[in-house]
Amino acid sequence: KFSKQSWGLENEALIVRCPRQGKPSYTVDWYYSQTNKSIPTQERNRVFASGQLLKFLPAAVADSGIYTCIVRSPTFNRTGYANVTIYKKQSDCNVPDYLMYSTVSGSEKNSKIYCPTIDLYNWTAPLEWFKNCQALQGSRYRAHKSFLVIDNVMTEDAGDYTCKFIHNENGANYSVTATRSFTVKDEQGFSLFPVIGAPAQNEIKEVEIGKNANLTCSACFGKGTQFLAAVLWQLNGTKITDFGEPRIQQEEGQNQSFSNGLACLDMVLRIADVKEEDLLLQYDCLALNLHGLRRHTVRLSRKNPIDHHS
C-alpha cells in the first residue's frame, strides 16, 4: 500500500520520492531494506538522502532493490517503500515496456505531452524531445517548460516520445531520459443549433390535480465540450425565478451527458400540488447556444382519475 515503483537507466540520474507525505520540517530517514543500512545524507555520496527524496547520482544496476523511508512526525512515524529498478541501457532504439511511463492521449485541440518525473529534478530548459529515437524537428513541435506541444495533431503523431534533460547537483551534470506513449483521439468536437429531444413541440402533458408533476426539457448541442449551452423553462414567457410561484421550481438533471458522443443538457420542471390555474399556463422549454435559441411549448391538461368498479 505504501510502496511506489521507480525505475531508471544506469549512468543516468534517478531521484525517488518517499511515498509518505508530511510537513517540510519533518525528518525523513532512508534505509536500504535488504541490509537495513542507513542511507547517508552527505551529498558527496553517489547515493544519498535529501529529505523526502532519495538521489542516485548516477544510478547503477546494483542499486536495484527496496528502500525504506520513515517520515518522523510528532505523534507517529510513517513508513513507506520505494521499489527501485535500474536497467542497463539498450543498444537498439526500442524502449521496452518496463521503462515506459503512463500513456497520454491527445487531440487536435490538446496535444501536451508532459515529461514524466521532471518535477523531481533541478533542470533547465530547453528539454530535448525524441519520437521513436528521432530528434523532433520542425515548427509543429514546441518544447515548452516541462512539456511538448504538437500543433495540428494527426494520427501519425502517435508513438513513443522520450524527453531528455540535464539534472544539476552542486555543479555536476547528469543526464535523465523518460519515455511515454502518446495516442491520438479523434475528438472532432462541433457545435450545432440546439436540438430539443423532449418535450415534443406543442405537447399536451396530462396531470392530476393535487398531485406532483415533472416536465423534462432535454436538448443536445453538438459533440465534445460546449463553450456555451443552456436549457431552461419559462412560464408564460417569464423566467421561473421571476414568476414567483414557489410550487414550481426547476433543477438541473444530467449536467452534460455525452450519450452517443453528443453533449446534452436536461432541466426538470417540478410542479408541486398541481392546481387548476397551472393548466392555463404556457410552459416553454428553451435551449440556447451560440447558434441561437429553440423553443418547444407544452400545455397541461387534466388527467381524469380512472374509476375502479368492483
Partner: antibody
Amino acid sequence: QVQLVQSGAEVKKPGASVKVSCKASGYTFINYGMNWVRQAPGQRLEWMGWINTYIGEPTYGDNFKGRVTITRDTSASTAYMELSSLRSEDTAVYYCAREGEGFAYWGQGTLVTVSS
Amino acid sequence: DIVMTQSPDSLAVSLGERATINCKSSQSLLYSGNQNNYLAWYQQKPGQPPKLLIYGASTRESGVPDRFSGSGSGTDFTLTISSLQAEDLAVYYCQNDHSYPYTFGGGTKVEIK
C-alpha cells in the same frame, strides 16, 4: 502562483451526499497533501481529514469517519471530498487547504446548504 | 483530541495600539525531534478563507507584515499585533498543527475601540 479552485455552491436535502472538488495549479500536485476543513455558521474551523496525493491514502477525523471520503485524481491535479448522510448541521463552507507548515494555501470555499 | 482555547473572545483596540491574543493547548505542541512548536495562527475576514500569518509558533509567513509576531512554546502561545491597522480587523484563529485531528481555537474577534 499556487491556486486552489473549488466547485460551486450546493443545496442538498437531508440524507443526500455532496461531492466537492478542489483543482490545484501552480505547483506539483503530488508533492503536497491536501486537507479539508469546514466552517459552519458561527462555529470554529473543523478539520475533516487529508489525503496523501502521491499514493492516494486518506486520513479522516474521528467526527467524520464513515461519512466522509477523500479522493484525488492526479491526472487532473484535483482532490475531492464527499460527505454522505447529510444533516442540517452539515450546512457549512467547506475548504481545501494544501498541507505544509500550517495551511498557507486555501481554496475559496464551497457553501453546502442542507435543507428539506 | 487536542483542545485549543483562545482568549479573549473579542478584543477592542485603538488604531496604532498593541493587540494581544492568547492560545492555550490541552497538550504540548513541541516536537522534541526537531524542537519545533507546531502551532499556526490565521486571520479570517468575512467571506474569505483563513490566511496563514504564523507557523511554527513564531515564524512569519512570507508577505505577512512584521507588526504580526508569534511567541510561546509547549502549551501557551501568543499572537501580537504591535500597531493595529484598520485592515487588521478580522477574526484570528490558532491551530494545533502538531497531531491529528488538527484542531482550531474558537477565534478572537479584533475590533476598533
